[in-house]
């Protein structure tokens, strides 16, 4: 991470970076197209999942861990 600060601290997993283990189950939201890694500025974007970047739209998208849902994998999946 760069030499910067956030205040107050945002809680969340920085999932999808080296050394981290995530299970890809659900894509939220579902989009087609080319994906790349997310900019590191989004390392806390996906709460319980892995971030990927929709290149054409220049937007982050989350692949949720099992049992989680929502655009940022912020909700427990009650149907899991």
């Amino acid at each position: 991470s760069g030499n910067s600060t956030r205040s107050p601290e945002t809680n969340g997993l920085s999932c999808g970076y080296p050394g981290e283990n995530c299970t890809a189950t659900t894509v939220q939201p579902k989009r087609k197209g080319h994906f790349s890694r997310c900019p590191k500025q989004y390392k806390h974007y996906c709460i319980k999942g892995r971030c990927r970047f929709v290149v054409a739209e220049q937007t982050p998208s989350c692949i949720c861990d099992e049992g989680y849902t929502g655009a940022r994998c912020e909700r427990v999946d009650l149907f899991y």
């Epitope: 991470s1 205040s7 900019p39 500025q41």
Partner: antibody, heavy 121, light 107 residues
Framework: QVQLVQSGAEVKKPGSSVKVSCKAS????????ISWVRQAPGQGLEWMGG????????VYAQKFQGRVTITADESTSTAYMELSSLRSEDTAVYYC??????????????WGQGTLVTVSS | DIQMTQSPSSLSASVGDRVTITCRAS??????LNWYQQKPGKAPKLLIY???NLQSGVPSRFSGSGSGTDFTLTISSLQPEDFATYYC?????????FGQGTKVEIK
Amino acid sequence: QVQLVQSGAEVKKPGSSVKVSCKASGGTFSSYAISWVRQAPGQGLEWMGGIVPWMGEAVYAQKFQGRVTITADESTSTAYMELSSLRSEDTAVYYCARSSSTYGIHAFDYWGQGTLVTVSS
Amino acid sequence: DIQMTQSPSSLSASVGDRVTITCRASQSISNFLNWYQQKPGKAPKLLIYAASNLQSGVPSRFSGSGSGTDFTLTISSLQPEDFATYYCQQYDDFPMTFGQGTKVEIK
């Protein structure tokens, strides 16, 4: 057409504070990240910090942490940058700039006209 | 912080010349890089986003390329209005950082 209109030039004493405003029109103010970028005379561009939509809060460059506060008033579509404990090295043109993204800080596609802040005793 | 280094710092060129400016990041930033043009007394103007995408309204003589750590801005045929200072900027990580600028002057 998006427009960012900044407040006028300021002359400040060392140790004092300055608050620069940036009023947006022609777009959805709350959806986009507003950053502040400064440029000292004859120098390059320096990002100070910005409000990040998905965080709902400001992020600051470490260099300015504790001295700068960036806020936004959605009711008036106006962003503010307050810099305290001013010193002569803070003499610069201060720009507000809108990020092209409604998520984070990406490219700065719209800029204010700049506000010259002169710090002198 | 991610350091952005531009080269050259300045260059002299003539109208019609092909001009190339390079920008190097201190670590890989994928293609999370933008280019701006700034004229004296004016705010910067976005030219290229995401390394190679031309911003709407920008003439097609401007192009960008590169990925990882090395990037290039090319002006295929320099026009009188292109004499300005050009900056690269990374948006991979906070804090956002700019190159020191490249001033394109008339030869």
